[in-house]
Interface confidence: low
C-alpha cells in the first residue's frame, strides 16, 4: 500500500479529464507512470550498492518538480537540475558505451558485458527508458491523454529536454577511450541530428577524453562493406578530430556472433573476424 | 557530505619549495577536474592548475608552468608541488573540483602560504 | 593571455534594489557560453552562483540571474539583501584549456 498512498493523488483516469485539456499530437503521459518511476527507483538502488544511499521518494519529488504545473512545450534543463544532482553518478574511464539509432543491441551489450554502461544503465536512463510524462500549467494533474510531439509541437518538452539533460551530462563525464554502437543499416549512420550526434559529440570533454571508437552494426548478413568509409562517418571523424580527440572505426558485421563472443570469448570461432 | 580539504601550507623563505595536497572526503576523484586556484591578501582569484582525474592530463597557467605541478597521488588526494618560491606567492591556496570541466562546484576552505625571509 | 574585465568596483546597493556587474572577456569565451559567477565572503572560499552564462547553481536563490554570451556577461541581483554584501567574480573557460578569473566587483548593501 505504500506506493498507493504516495500516488493516489495522482490517479486520474483519462475519461475524468477535464473536457478543456490541450490535445497534443503525441501519446499521452504512460500508464501508472509515478508508480512506474518510483518503483524502478527502488529496484535501481536495490541492485547497485553504490546508489543505496538514494532515497527515491526525493528522486520522484525532483522529477515531478521538473515537469508538474509547468506548460509543457516550456521546459528547461535547469528545471531537471533538483534530479540530475541526486541521480549523480560516475562511470569508470574507457566504459561508456553511447548509441545511436540502435539501443537494443547497445542494451544487450552491457546487459553481457557488465563493466560497461550506456545512458539507460544508469539511475537516471534507467527511470525513464520507454516512457513518456508530460504535465498542465498551473495544474498539479499528470496529462495521461497526450503529450507534446517533438517534430508536431515542439521540442522543449519534458521528455526531449530530459534526455538532452542527462544525455549531455552522460557524455560530460564520460572519460578514457569512449565508444559509440552505430546502427550501419540505416541511411544516415551518423546523424547528426540524433541525440548522439546534437549533444552527445559535442559535450565529450578532450581533457578526458582520449579518443571515440565507434562500431558500426551491419544489418545483412552479406554485407562485407566497409562501412568505416561511409560519409557520414567521416563527418564524425572530422567533428571529433577538430575537438582534438582521437576518432577509430570498427565494422562489426555479425552482430549475433559479436555478442556471442563478448559472452564467450574463448570460443574458436571468435577468433576470427566478427 | 562531499568535501575538499587543503593542507600543507606553511611559511617559507623565498627560493624554497613546498608541497600542498588536496584531500576529498565523501567522494572519489573519478572523472572529476580537479584544480588549484590561489589568492594573494586582499586581492582577486587566479588559475593555477587543473587535473583531470579519470585521463590523468594536466594543464597549467602559463606562468605556472615549470614552478608548478599537479599530480593525482590517490583516488582521494591531489598534490601542488611549488618550486622557486617569492613573496610574490604568499596567498591562500584553494583546491576546487569540477565535475564537468568549466565551473568549480566545490572547494575547500583554502591552506595559506606565507613566503618571508 | 585571457582577460576578463569586470564593472564597476565597488557598487553599491539599498536593500531591496538591484544590482548589475557586468564582465568583459578579452576573446569569446568557449561554445560563447562557458562563464560562471561566484560570491565570496571574507575568511571563506568563493560560492559557485552561475554556470554556463545563466544557469543557477544548486541551493542559489532565484535573486540571482545573468546573462550574455560571447565576450560580454551580465549578473543581476534583485531585491538586494543584506546577505548579499561579498566580491562577486566571473570566471571563463576556454578551449585552451585555460581558465581565467575576472578581478572581482566588492557590494557593499547600505
Known amino acids: 500500500s505504500g506506493l498507493n498512498d504516495i500516488f493516489e493523488a495522482q490517479k486520474i483516469e483519462w475519461h475524468e479529464l477535464p473536457r478543456w485539456r490541450q490535445q497534443w499530437s503525441g501519446s499521452g503521459t504512460t500508464s501508472r507512470f509515478p508508480e512506474t518511476v518510483l518503483a524502478r527507483c527502488v529496484k535501481y538502488t536495490e541492485v547497485h550498492p553504490e546508489m543505496r544511499h538514494v532515497d527515491c521518494q526525493s528522486v520522484w519529488d525532483a522529477f515531478k518538480g521538473a515537469f508538474i504545473s509547468k506548460y509543457p512545450c516550456n521546459i528547461t534543463e535547469e528545471d531537471y537540475q533538483p534530479l540530475v544532482k541526486l541521480g549523480t553518478q560516475t562511470v569508470p574511464c574507457n566504459k561508456t558505451l553511447l548509441w545511436s539509432r540502435i539501443k537494443d543491441l547497445a542494451h544487450q551489450f552491457t546487459q553481457v558485458q557488465r563493466d560497461m554502461f550506456t545512458l539507460e544503465d544508469m539511475l537516471l536512463g534507467y527511470l525513464a527508458d520507454d516512457l513518456t510524462w508530460c504535465g498542465e500549467f498551473n495544474t498539479f494533474e499528470i496529462n495521461y491523454q497526450s503529450c507534446p510531439d517533438w517534430r508536431k509541437d515542439c521540442s522543449n518538452n519534458p521528455v526531449s529536454v530530459f534526455w538532452k539533460t542527462v544525455s549531455r551530462r552522460f557524455a560530460e563525464t564520460a572519460c578514457g577511450v569512449v565508444h559509440v554502437m552505430l546502427n550501419g543499416s540505416r541511411s544516415k549512420i551518423f546523424d547528426k541530428n540524433s541525440t548522439f550526434g546534437s549533444v552527445e559529440v559535442h559535450n565529450l570533454q578532450p581533457e578526458k577524453v582520449q579518443a571515440l571508437e565507434a562500431w558500426v552494426i551491419h544489418g545483412g548478413r552479406e554485407d562485407s562493406r566497409d562501412l568505416c568509409q561511409d560519409p557520414t562517418i567521416k563527418e564524425l571523424e572530422s567533428i571529433i578530430s577538430k575537438r582534438n580527440i582521437r576518432f577509430f572505426c570498427k565494422n562489426i558485421y555479425r552482430p549475433d556472433k559479436f555478442l556471442q563472443c563478448v559472452k564467450n570469448p574463448e570460443d574458436s570461432s571468435c577468433l576470427s573476424g566478427i | 557530505q562531499e568535501q575538499l580539504e587543503e593542507s600543507g601550507g606553511d611559511l617559507v623563505k623565498p627560493e624554497g619549495s613546498l608541497t600542498l595536497t588536496c584531500t576529498a572526503s565523501?567522494?572519489?576523484?573519478?572523472?572529476?577536474?580537479i584544480c588549484w586556484v590561489r589568492q594573494a591578501p586582499g586581492k582577486g582569484l587566479e588559475w593555477i592548475a587543473c587535473i583531470y582525474a579519470g585521463s590523468g592530463n594536466t594543464y597549467y597557467a602559463s606562468w605556472a608552468k615549470g614552478r608548478f605541478s599537479i599530480s593525482k597521488t590517490s583516488s582521494t588526494t591531489v598534490t601542488l608541488q611549488m618550486t622557486s618560491l617569492t613573496v610574490a606567492d604568499t596567498a591562500t591556496y584553494f583546491c576546487?573540483?569540477?565535475?564537468?570541466?568549466?565551473?568549480?562546484?566545490?572547494w575547500g576552505p583554502g591552506t595559506l602560504v606565507t613566503v618571508s625571509s | 593571455a585571457q582577460v576578463l574585465t569586470q564593472t564597476p568596483s565597488p557598487v553599491s546597493a539599498a536593500v531591496g534594489g538591484t544590482v548589475t556587474i557586468n564582465c568583459q572577456a578579452s576573446?569569446?569565451?568557449?561554445?560563447?557560453?562557458?562563464l560562471a559567477w561566484y560570491q565570496q565572503k571574507p575568511g571563506q572560499p568563493p560560492k559557485l552562483l552561475i554556470y554556463?552564462?545563466?544557469n543557477l547553481a544548486s541551493g542559489v536563490p532565484s535573486r540571482f540571474s545573468a546573462s550574455g554570451s560571447g565576450t560580454q556577461f551580465t549578473l543581476t541581483i534583485s531585491e538586494v539583501q543584506s546577505d548579499d554584501a561579498a566580491t562577486y567574480y566571473c570566471q571563463a573557460y576556454y578551449r585552451d584549456p585555460t581558465t581565467a578569473f575576472g578581478g572581482g566587483t566588492e557590494v557593499v548593501v547600505k
Open positions: 576546487a573540483s569540477a565535475d564537468t570541466i568549466d565551473y568549480f562546484n566545490l
Open positions: 554556463r552564462a545563466s
Open positions: 565523501g567522494f572519489s576523484f573519478s572523472n572529476d577536474a
Open positions: 576573446q569569446s569565451v568557449y561554445n560563447n557560453n562557458y
